[in-house]
């Protein structure tokens, strides 16, 4: 199966959404769990994650084309506690598949702003404020 994971972020006012997107075929969904970890370089797992999403096969989707499933983790107000290194991952023990996305970072600056770095994938950004920068 051709399956991959991407990371992205979007800003809505003071909120920052961290998004893990898994691209997969319809029939590959069952058994997968997508999860987002913080500051876990070697032991990112659903048990140690900030949030997890178990994928389900959607009988309403026809065909075998590539579809996407998203996990969204929302930070309502970014604070220094949110600084760190994040990673999107996915796993299916049923199929023996694990996917590890690129590491990306949130850095809270002394001026009260923050930056998100290391997002190499496509993004759809909605900036309402200039408090945050994504690069």
């Amino acid at each position: 199966g051709c399956i991959n994971i991407t990371s992205s972020a979007s800003q809505e006012g003071t909120r920052l959404n961290l998004i893990c997107t898994v691209w997969h075929k319809k029939e590959e969904a069952e058994g997968f769990v997508v999860f987002l970890c913080k500051d876990r370089s070697g032991d990112c797992s659903p048990e140690t994650s900030l949030k997890q999403l178990r994928l389900k096969r959607d009988p309403g989707i026809d065909g075998v084309g590539e579809i996407s499933s998203q996990l969204m983790f929302t930070i309502s107000q970014v604070t220094p506690l949110h600084s760190g290194t994040y990673q999107c991952c996915a796993r299916s023990q049923k199929s023996g598949i694990r996917l590890q996305g690129h590491f990306f970072s949130i850095l809270f600056t002394e001026t009260g702003n923050y930056t998100v770095t290391g997002l190499k994938q496509r993004q759809h950004l909605e900036f309402s404020h200039n408090e945050g920068t994504l690069s």
Epitope: I3, G31, Q93, G96, I97, R98, Q100
Partner: antibody
Framework: EVQLVESGPGLVQPSETLSLTCTVS????????VNWFRQPPGKGLEWMGT???????DYNSALKSRLSISRDTSKSQVFLKMNSLQTEDTAIYFC??????WGQGTLVTVSS | DIVMTQSPKSMSISVGDRVTMNCKAS??????IAWYQQKPGQSPKLLIY???NRYTGVPDRFTGSGSGTDFTLTITNMQTEDLAVYYC?????????FGGGTKLELK
């Protein structure tokens, strides 16, 4: 069609090393992972370890010190090596894609 | 390690019976449980994964339920081809561990 076939010696001497091969077809080892399981005759099942699609491995802690799982993706083969075999390692050894598709297994007897 | 305790160890049943077997985990394993059927001389066949998801091609008389520590496999309208040993597997924690099995025999 997904298939997994285990092969190796039927008889191993105590204290020697067991080498088994799992040859897969119908899928790529870079897309799916393989587990090894074993079952002593007439007894229950034991998980031994995993080699994930990305090549990473997880092992049963009870076997970790003497177990190694590797692969050759170009040959669609997964290898199990276990040293210091004892009679209690006599079992049918199975490989499986994830935990869904299983091979038929190969019987390994440890005896002098 | 997580200990999976299956009960009963064996059952004598008749064709058409409703059969229920249990698996108890020594710790919370969420829903990360699979059920297998194994017939003599064959490899285990996956029936249920994630506690209640029926695997492709498995007849709908097989149903899995439960979460946390207590799990059940139910066979409604038992058939002769269902005579086998059934194992539960937890895959929430390493090492993955199996129950000791439940053997179904004809009365």
């Amino acid at each position: 069609e997904v298939q997994l076939v285990e092969s190796g010696p039927g008889l191993v001497q105590p204290s020697e090393t067991l080498s088994l091969t799992c040859t897969v077809s119908g899928f790529s080892l870079t897309s799916y992972g393989v587990n090894w399981f074993r079952q002593p005759p007439g007894k229950g099942l034991e998980w031994m370890g995993t080699i994930w699609n990305d090549g990473g491995t997880d092992y049963n802690s009870a076997l970790k010190s003497r177990l190694s799982i590797s692969r050759d993706t170009s040959k669609s083969q997964v290898f199990l090596k276990m040293n210091s075999l004892q009679t209690e390692d006599t079992a049918i050894y199975f490989c499986a894609r994830g935990f869904e598709y299983w091979g038929q297994g190969t019987l390994v007897t440890v005896s002098s | 390690d997580i200990v999976m305790t299956q009960s009963p160890k064996s059952m004598s049943i008749s064709v058409g019976d409703r059969v229920t077997m249990n698996c108890k985990a020594s710790q919370n394993v969420g829903k990360n449980i699979a059920w297998y059927q194994q017939k003599p001389g064959q490899s285990p066949k996956l029936l249920i994964y994630y506690a209640s998801n029926r695997y492709t091609g498995v007849p709908d008389r097989f149903t899995g339920s439960g979460s946390g520590t207590d799990f059940t496999l139910t066979i409604t309208n038992m058939q002769t081809e269902d005579l086998a040993v059934y194992y539960c597997l937890q895959y929430n924690y390493n090492p993955w561990t199996f129950g000791g099995g439940t053997k179904l025999e004809l009365k």
